[in-house]
Interface confidence: medium
Protein backbone atom coordinates (compact mmCIF):
# COMPACT_ATOMS: atom_id res chain seq x y z
CA UNK A 1 0.00 0.00 0.00
CA UNK A 2 1.29 3.44 -0.96
CA UNK A 3 2.38 5.41 2.10
CA UNK A 4 3.15 8.76 0.45
CA UNK A 5 2.21 10.65 -2.68
CA UNK A 6 4.76 11.71 -5.33
CA UNK A 7 6.74 14.79 -4.43
CA UNK A 8 5.61 18.11 -5.90
CA UNK A 9 7.70 20.41 -8.08
CA UNK A 10 8.81 23.72 -6.64
CA UNK A 11 10.15 26.74 -8.51
CA UNK A 12 10.28 30.51 -8.35
CA UNK A 13 8.80 32.99 -10.81
CA UNK A 14 10.17 34.97 -12.46
CA UNK A 15 13.43 33.59 -11.08
CA UNK A 16 14.97 32.15 -7.96
CA UNK A 17 17.41 35.07 -7.80
CA UNK A 18 15.40 38.04 -6.62
CA UNK A 19 16.68 41.62 -6.45
CA UNK A 20 16.21 43.26 -3.07
CA UNK A 21 12.72 44.77 -2.61
CA UNK A 22 11.37 43.04 -5.73
CA UNK A 23 8.53 40.54 -5.81
CA UNK A 24 8.72 36.81 -6.33
CA UNK A 25 6.22 33.97 -6.45
CA UNK A 26 7.06 30.49 -5.20
CA UNK A 27 5.10 27.89 -7.13
CA UNK A 28 4.30 24.40 -5.93
CA UNK A 29 2.77 21.90 -8.33
CA UNK A 30 1.32 18.71 -6.89
CA UNK A 31 -1.72 16.69 -7.95
CA UNK A 32 -5.32 17.45 -8.73
CA UNK A 33 -7.41 16.73 -5.67
CA UNK A 34 -4.84 18.00 -3.21
CA UNK A 35 -6.72 19.71 -0.40
CA UNK A 36 -3.73 21.41 1.25
CA UNK A 37 -0.28 22.66 0.31
CA UNK A 38 2.36 23.62 2.84
CA UNK A 39 5.40 25.75 2.12
CA UNK A 40 8.35 25.20 4.44
CA UNK A 41 11.20 27.66 4.89
CA UNK A 42 14.45 26.51 6.47
CA UNK A 43 12.66 23.46 7.83
CA UNK A 44 9.74 25.29 9.45
CA UNK A 45 6.18 25.83 8.27
CA UNK A 46 6.00 29.12 6.39
CA UNK A 47 2.61 29.22 4.65
CA UNK A 48 -0.46 27.09 3.92
CA UNK A 49 -2.82 27.14 0.94
CA UNK A 50 -6.03 25.17 0.47
CA UNK A 51 -7.08 25.30 -3.19
CA UNK A 52 -10.73 25.52 -4.10
CA UNK A 53 -11.98 23.44 -5.81
CA UNK A 54 -9.11 20.99 -5.23
CA UNK A 55 -10.14 18.68 -8.06
CA UNK A 56 -9.52 21.45 -10.62
CA UNK A 57 -6.27 22.87 -9.27
CA UNK A 58 -2.86 21.21 -9.19
CA UNK A 59 -0.65 24.21 -8.50
CA UNK A 60 -0.54 26.90 -5.82
CA UNK A 61 1.45 30.12 -5.56
CA UNK A 62 2.99 31.79 -2.54
CA UNK A 63 3.60 35.47 -3.19
CA UNK A 64 6.46 37.43 -1.62
CA UNK A 65 5.93 41.13 -2.40
CA UNK A 66 9.15 42.55 -0.99
CA UNK A 67 12.21 40.34 -1.13
CA UNK A 68 14.80 40.85 1.57
CA UNK A 69 17.64 38.98 3.19
CA UNK A 70 15.37 37.43 5.82
CA UNK A 71 13.37 35.72 3.07
CA UNK A 72 16.41 34.21 1.39
CA UNK A 73 17.07 30.56 2.07
CA UNK A 74 15.81 27.07 1.35
CA UNK A 75 12.17 26.40 0.61
CA UNK A 76 10.31 23.15 0.05
CA UNK A 77 6.66 22.24 -0.25
CA UNK A 78 4.38 19.28 0.41
CA UNK A 79 0.71 18.58 -0.30
CA UNK A 80 -1.94 16.16 0.87
CA UNK A 81 -4.86 14.37 -0.67
CA UNK A 82 -7.24 13.35 2.06
CA UNK A 83 -5.03 12.22 4.93
CA UNK A 84 -2.16 11.12 2.72
CA UNK A 85 0.84 13.47 2.52
CA UNK A 86 3.34 13.71 -0.32
CA UNK A 87 7.08 13.40 -0.20
CA UNK A 88 8.67 16.84 0.21
CA UNK A 89 9.71 18.64 -2.95
CA UNK A 90 13.30 19.30 -3.88
CA UNK A 91 14.85 22.26 -2.10
CA UNK A 92 14.53 25.66 -3.73
CA UNK A 93 17.30 28.10 -2.87
CA UNK A 94 15.76 31.56 -2.98
CA UNK A 95 18.50 34.15 -3.21
CA UNK A 96 18.30 37.86 -2.57
CA UNK A 97 20.53 39.83 -4.87
CA UNK A 98 22.00 43.27 -4.32
CA UNK A 99 24.20 43.22 -7.31
CA UNK A 100 25.59 46.74 -7.38
CA UNK A 101 27.36 46.50 -4.06
CA UNK A 102 31.10 46.90 -3.76
CA UNK A 103 32.96 45.52 -0.75
CA UNK A 104 35.76 47.37 0.97
CA UNK A 105 39.13 45.66 1.31
CA UNK A 106 41.58 46.78 3.95
CA UNK A 107 44.79 45.34 5.31
CA UNK A 108 46.33 45.38 8.78
CA UNK A 109 48.82 46.60 9.85
CA UNK A 110 49.06 48.28 6.44
CA UNK A 111 49.89 47.78 2.78
CA UNK A 112 53.65 48.14 3.36
CA UNK A 113 55.09 45.57 5.73
CA UNK A 114 58.34 43.83 6.53
CA UNK A 115 58.85 40.16 5.77
CA UNK A 116 57.81 38.12 8.80
CA UNK A 117 55.06 40.47 9.92
CA UNK A 118 51.60 39.02 10.39
CA UNK A 119 49.18 40.46 7.86
CA UNK A 120 45.39 40.24 7.84
CA UNK A 121 43.05 41.35 5.07
CA UNK A 122 39.51 42.46 5.92
CA UNK A 123 36.72 42.37 3.37
CA UNK A 124 33.58 44.25 4.36
CA UNK A 125 30.19 44.49 2.65
CA UNK A 126 27.29 46.00 4.58
CA UNK A 127 24.59 43.89 2.97
CA UNK A 128 23.31 40.34 3.18
CA UNK A 129 26.54 38.61 2.31
CA UNK A 130 27.49 35.22 3.67
CA UNK A 131 30.73 34.39 1.90
CA UNK A 132 33.75 36.39 0.82
CA UNK A 133 36.65 35.58 -1.47
CA UNK A 134 40.08 37.13 -1.46
CA UNK A 135 41.82 36.88 -4.82
CA UNK A 136 45.33 37.84 -5.75
CA UNK A 137 45.41 39.31 -9.22
CA UNK A 138 47.24 37.18 -11.74
CA UNK A 139 47.05 33.67 -13.04
CA UNK A 140 46.83 31.94 -9.70
CA UNK A 141 44.40 29.29 -8.58
CA UNK A 142 44.92 30.22 -4.96
CA UNK A 143 41.83 31.67 -3.37
CA UNK A 144 41.05 32.26 0.26
CA UNK A 145 37.46 31.94 1.39
CA UNK A 146 35.97 33.63 4.44
CA UNK A 147 32.60 33.95 6.12
CA UNK A 148 30.84 36.66 8.03
CA UNK A 149 27.67 38.67 8.13
CA UNK A 150 29.29 41.90 7.02
CA UNK A 151 33.02 41.26 7.21
CA UNK A 152 35.46 38.40 6.77
CA UNK A 153 39.04 38.18 8.00
CA UNK A 154 41.77 36.71 5.85
CA UNK A 155 44.88 36.10 7.95
CA UNK A 156 47.96 35.53 5.80
CA UNK A 157 50.14 34.86 8.81
CA UNK A 158 53.78 35.92 8.70
CA UNK A 159 54.29 37.14 5.15
CA UNK A 160 57.24 36.79 2.82
CA UNK A 161 58.11 38.56 -0.40
CA UNK A 162 56.05 35.84 -2.11
CA UNK A 163 52.91 37.56 -0.81
CA UNK A 164 53.63 40.74 -2.76
CA UNK A 165 50.91 41.63 -5.20
CA UNK A 166 47.53 43.18 -5.81
CA UNK A 167 44.55 41.82 -3.91
CA UNK A 168 40.81 42.25 -4.33
CA UNK A 169 37.85 40.73 -2.61
CA UNK A 170 34.33 39.80 -3.64
CA UNK A 171 31.20 39.17 -1.63
CA UNK A 172 28.89 36.37 -2.66
CA UNK A 173 25.25 35.76 -1.95
CA UNK A 174 24.49 32.11 -1.31
CA UNK A 175 27.07 31.16 -3.96
CA UNK A 176 24.74 32.46 -6.64
CA UNK A 177 25.28 36.20 -6.87
CA UNK A 178 28.54 38.03 -6.67
CA UNK A 179 29.31 41.60 -5.77
CA UNK A 180 31.55 43.90 -7.71
CA UNK A 181 35.23 43.61 -6.79
CA UNK A 182 36.67 45.79 -4.10
CA UNK A 183 39.16 48.47 -4.94
CA UNK A 184 42.56 46.83 -5.30
CA UNK A 185 44.99 46.77 -2.41
CA UNK A 186 48.65 46.41 -3.30
CA UNK A 187 50.66 44.58 -0.66
CA UNK A 188 54.31 45.56 -0.56
CA UNK A 189 56.57 43.27 1.44
CA UNK A 190 60.11 44.39 2.12
CA UNK A 191 62.42 41.37 2.05
CA UNK A 192 64.66 40.52 4.98
CA UNK A 193 68.45 40.54 4.76
CA UNK A 194 68.79 36.81 4.14
CA UNK A 195 66.18 36.69 1.36
CA UNK A 196 65.96 39.76 -0.81
CA UNK A 197 65.40 38.02 -4.13
CA UNK A 198 62.26 38.88 -6.02
CA UNK A 199 59.53 36.31 -5.74
CA UNK A 200 57.74 34.88 -8.78
CA UNK A 201 54.55 36.68 -9.75
CA UNK A 202 52.21 33.93 -8.56
CA UNK A 203 53.88 31.80 -5.93
CA UNK A 204 52.50 28.74 -4.29
CA UNK A 205 51.28 29.99 -0.94
CA UNK A 206 52.12 28.12 2.26
CA UNK A 207 49.51 25.48 2.98
CA UNK A 208 48.72 26.94 6.38
CA UNK A 209 47.74 30.32 4.97
CA UNK A 210 46.10 29.61 1.62
CA UNK A 211 43.87 26.83 0.46
CA UNK A 212 45.18 25.51 -2.83
CA UNK A 213 42.00 25.11 -4.83
CA UNK A 214 42.47 24.09 -8.43
CA UNK A 215 39.32 25.17 -10.21
CA UNK A 216 38.69 22.50 -12.80
CA UNK A 217 35.72 21.77 -15.00
CA UNK A 218 34.45 19.48 -12.29
CA UNK A 219 34.16 22.38 -9.84
CA UNK A 220 30.77 23.49 -11.12
CA UNK A 221 28.22 20.84 -10.22
CA UNK A 222 24.92 21.39 -11.97
CA UNK A 223 21.65 19.78 -10.95
CA UNK A 224 18.68 20.16 -13.22
CA UNK A 225 15.24 19.97 -11.65
CA UNK A 226 12.14 20.13 -13.80
CA UNK A 227 10.44 23.51 -13.91
CA UNK A 228 13.08 25.47 -12.09
CA UNK A 229 16.56 26.71 -12.81
CA UNK A 230 18.96 26.07 -10.01
CA UNK A 231 22.71 25.80 -10.16
CA UNK A 232 24.29 24.09 -7.18
CA UNK A 233 27.71 25.65 -7.15
CA UNK A 234 30.10 23.55 -5.15
CA UNK A 235 32.46 26.47 -4.81
CA UNK A 236 35.98 25.67 -3.73
CA UNK A 237 35.05 22.58 -1.74
Amino acid sequence: QQQTLPKPFIWAEPHFMVPKEKQVTICCQGNYGAVEYQLHFEGSLFAVDRPKPPERINKVQFYIPDMNSRMAGQYSCIYRVGELWSEPSNLLDLVVTEMYDTPTLSVHPGPEVISGEKVTFYCRLDTATSMFLLLKEGRSSHVQRGYGKVQAEFPLGPVTTAHRGTYRCFGSYNNHAWSFPSEPVKLLVTGDIENTSLAPEDPTFPADTWGTYLLTTETGLQKDHALWDHTAQNLLR
Epitope: P19, M99, Y100, F170, S172, A177, L215, T231, L236
Partner: nanobody, 115 residues
Framework: QVQLVESGGGLVQPGGSLRLSCAAS????????MFWVRQAPGEGFEWISV????????DYAASVKGRFTISRDNAKNTLYLQMNSLKTEDTAVYYC????????RGQGTLVTVSS
Protein backbone atom coordinates in the same frame (compact mmCIF):
# COMPACT_ATOMS: atom_id res chain seq x y z
CA GLN B 1 19.63 24.68 -17.92
CA VAL B 2 22.27 27.39 -17.79
CA GLN B 3 24.17 27.69 -21.06
CA LEU B 4 27.01 30.06 -21.89
CA VAL B 5 28.52 29.78 -25.36
CA GLU B 6 31.63 31.79 -26.18
CA SER B 7 32.86 32.59 -29.67
CA GLY B 8 35.24 34.93 -31.48
CA GLY B 9 38.59 33.52 -30.45
CA GLY B 10 41.43 32.81 -32.84
CA LEU B 11 45.03 33.52 -33.75
CA VAL B 12 46.11 37.14 -33.75
CA GLN B 13 49.43 38.96 -33.89
CA PRO B 14 50.71 41.03 -30.97
CA GLY B 15 49.11 44.45 -31.05
CA GLY B 16 46.03 43.09 -32.81
CA SER B 17 42.40 43.03 -31.74
CA LEU B 18 39.62 40.49 -31.22
CA ARG B 19 36.02 40.68 -30.09
CA LEU B 20 34.64 37.81 -28.06
CA SER B 21 30.93 37.10 -27.69
CA CYS B 22 29.03 34.99 -25.19
CA ALA B 23 25.47 33.87 -25.85
CA ALA B 24 23.59 33.17 -22.60
CA SER B 25 20.44 31.10 -22.12
CA UNK B 26 18.60 29.15 -19.46
CA UNK B 27 18.62 31.90 -16.85
CA UNK B 28 17.59 35.52 -16.39
CA UNK B 29 20.67 37.08 -17.98
CA UNK B 30 19.74 40.65 -17.03
CA UNK B 31 19.59 39.70 -13.32
CA UNK B 32 23.28 38.88 -13.15
CA UNK B 33 26.59 40.62 -13.01
CA MET B 34 28.58 38.90 -15.75
CA PHE B 35 32.29 38.16 -15.80
CA TRP B 36 35.06 37.26 -18.19
CA VAL B 37 37.74 34.96 -16.84
CA ARG B 38 40.63 33.31 -18.61
CA GLN B 39 42.89 30.32 -18.15
CA ALA B 40 46.33 30.04 -19.69
CA PRO B 41 47.72 26.56 -20.39
CA GLY B 42 48.65 24.88 -17.12
CA GLU B 43 47.50 27.88 -15.07
CA GLY B 44 44.57 28.70 -12.83
CA PHE B 45 41.67 30.95 -13.68
CA GLU B 46 42.29 34.68 -13.80
CA TRP B 47 39.39 37.05 -13.32
CA ILE B 48 39.73 39.86 -15.85
CA SER B 49 36.45 41.82 -16.06
CA VAL B 50 32.96 42.30 -14.69
CA UNK B 51 29.92 44.25 -15.87
CA UNK B 52 26.81 45.05 -13.86
CA UNK B 53 23.25 44.05 -14.72
CA UNK B 54 22.38 47.23 -16.58
CA UNK B 55 25.65 47.41 -18.48
CA UNK B 56 26.55 50.88 -17.25
CA UNK B 57 29.33 49.94 -14.80
CA UNK B 58 32.36 47.78 -15.46
CA ASP B 59 35.65 46.93 -13.82
CA TYR B 60 38.88 45.27 -14.94
CA ALA B 61 41.89 43.49 -13.53
CA ALA B 62 45.08 45.51 -13.73
CA SER B 63 46.52 43.20 -16.38
CA VAL B 64 43.91 44.21 -18.98
CA LYS B 65 42.76 47.66 -17.87
CA GLY B 66 42.88 50.17 -20.70
CA ARG B 67 43.10 47.47 -23.37
CA PHE B 68 39.94 45.38 -22.87
CA THR B 69 36.33 46.58 -22.84
CA ILE B 70 33.41 44.53 -21.54
CA SER B 71 29.85 45.21 -22.69
CA ARG B 72 26.49 43.48 -22.85
CA ASP B 73 23.23 43.48 -24.77
CA ASN B 74 20.44 42.33 -22.46
CA ALA B 75 17.94 42.27 -25.32
CA LYS B 76 20.11 39.67 -27.06
CA ASN B 77 21.30 37.92 -23.87
CA THR B 78 24.86 38.43 -25.05
CA LEU B 79 28.08 39.44 -23.33
CA TYR B 80 31.04 40.90 -25.22
CA LEU B 81 34.75 41.46 -24.67
CA GLN B 82 36.61 43.80 -27.01
CA MET B 83 40.33 43.07 -26.74
CA ASN B 84 42.79 45.59 -28.17
CA SER B 85 46.59 45.86 -28.07
CA LEU B 86 46.84 42.14 -27.46
CA LYS B 87 50.04 40.75 -25.94
CA THR B 88 51.51 37.26 -26.06
CA GLU B 89 50.68 36.89 -22.37
CA ASP B 90 46.99 37.27 -23.22
CA THR B 91 47.09 33.80 -24.81
CA ALA B 92 44.50 31.74 -22.94
CA VAL B 93 41.08 30.15 -23.10
CA TYR B 94 38.52 32.87 -22.38
CA TYR B 95 35.28 32.09 -20.58
CA CYS B 96 32.22 34.14 -19.77
CA UNK B 97 30.91 33.35 -16.32
CA UNK B 98 28.43 34.29 -13.62
CA UNK B 99 31.11 34.49 -10.93
CA UNK B 100 34.70 35.72 -10.78
CA UNK B 101 36.09 32.20 -10.42
CA UNK B 102 34.51 30.78 -13.56
CA UNK B 103 32.50 28.22 -11.62
CA UNK B 104 29.43 28.68 -13.81
CA ARG B 105 30.97 29.19 -17.22
CA GLY B 106 30.83 28.18 -20.87
CA GLN B 107 33.14 25.89 -22.80
CA GLY B 108 35.51 28.73 -23.61
CA THR B 109 37.11 30.17 -26.73
CA LEU B 110 40.85 30.00 -27.38
CA VAL B 111 42.75 33.21 -28.01
CA THR B 112 46.31 32.78 -29.27
CA VAL B 113 48.53 35.85 -29.55
CA SER B 114 51.64 35.01 -31.51
CA SER B 115 53.79 36.41 -34.26
Amino acid sequence: QVQLVESGGGLVQPGGSLRLSCAASGFAFSNYNMFWVRQAPGEGFEWISVINRGGDTADYAASVKGRFTISRDNAKNTLYLQMNSLKTEDTAVYYCARDPLGTTRGQGTLVTVSS
